[in-house]
């Protein structure tokens, strides 16, 4: 039975040209986290596990940095980076937990962090 919950940074906004940290945290489960995937829509951005370390897709390597922790840092943001991002926690024996973050990249300096929320 899957008992865990994923807490994410929720709906966030950031300025064009700036950077943002995408963060997820899995709690309320004793399952092993065997791998974390970061995806943007259907594109795999990065993977991390202890056998592999961090691996960033070559398409994003200039603008995506691993961490902090199991999070992901997006740099040199463009308006095209606006959209949904998913952290996918592969665990044993529970299975897969997915967290969703919506990022809006703004032209002006009105960017403001949204509230944190939980996804069961």
């Amino acid at each position: 039975m899957m008992t865990g919950t994923i807490e994410t940074t929720g709906n966030i906004s950031a300025e064009k040209g700036g950077s943002i940290i995408l963060q997820c945290h899995l709690s309320s489960t004793t399952a092993q986290v065997t791998q974390v995937n970061w995806e943007q829509q259907d594109q795999l951005l990065a993977i991390c596990n202890a056998d592999l370390g961090w691996h960033i897709s070559p398409s994003f390597k200039d603008r995506v940095a691993p961490g902090p922790g199991l999070g992901l840092t997006l740099q040199s943001l463009t308006v095209n980076d606006t959209g949904e991002y998913f952290c996918i926690y592969h665990t044993y024996p529970d299975g897969t937990y997915t967290g969703r973050i919506f990022l809006e990249v703004l032209e002006s300096s009105v960017a403001e962090h949204g509230a944190r929320f939980q996804i069961p």
């Epitope: 092993q32 791998q35 596990n49 202890a50 056998d51 691996h55 960033i56």
Partner: antibody
Framework: QVQLVQSGAEVKKPGSSVKVSCKAS????????ISWVRQAPGQGLEWMGV????????NYAQKFQGRVTVTADESTSTAYMELSSLRSEDTAVYYC???????????????WGQGTTVTVSS | DIQMTQSPSSLSASVGDRVTITCRAS??????LNWYQQKPGKAPKLLIY???SLQSGVPSRFSGSGSGTDFTLTISSLQPEDFATYYC?????????FGGGTKVEIK
Amino acid sequence: QVQLVQSGAEVKKPGSSVKVSCKASGGTFQNYAISWVRQAPGQGLEWMGVIVPIFGTANYAQKFQGRVTVTADESTSTAYMELSSLRSEDTAVYYCARLHLGQKAYYGMDVWGQGTTVTVSS
Amino acid sequence: DIQMTQSPSSLSASVGDRVTITCRASQSISSYLNWYQQKPGKAPKLLIYAASSLQSGVPSRFSGSGSGTDFTLTISSLQPEDFATYYCQQRYVFPPTFGGGTKVEIK
């Protein structure tokens, strides 16, 4: 059933390089990474590095950083490990091993190549 | 890097004996531990993953236990084909590291 088939034994001079291949027979590299592990005569297992073929990106043990290069050719499902500036201490059996990506990552290295003996001698 | 220490480094046992091998991590690794068996001239073979889960096709006389820093591989009744070297490996923190191995020999 996926098998990893490695290239044959090599004898090399100190200071030279060796390139060992590892071909996935009966399967592809989709959803897998390939690790490289070596074993000196009478010694234990030593992890060297890993490649994720879908990205073509590799990470290495600090001890081998700058001297080892791991690559993969997805079209032929073959991974390669090149070790340069060889010395006598590099005499060992070199193994490739499969790692699952994603949900089955907990398995660890569940399929291994047969090993390639590399002898470094002047 | 996390250091993995196995004990004993070698042991002699007879067919039918119960054999216990221990592995200690230099820091807590939860249950992120695998065990491998290696016979002379052969590649290692995965026996146990996640500290206690038996890999498909591995006989049930093999079992693993432990979490945190201390782990055990037990062979409940040693068979002739079990004479080999056994390695533990942590996959909690990159890079993965192996123990030094325990050689199980015939008494």
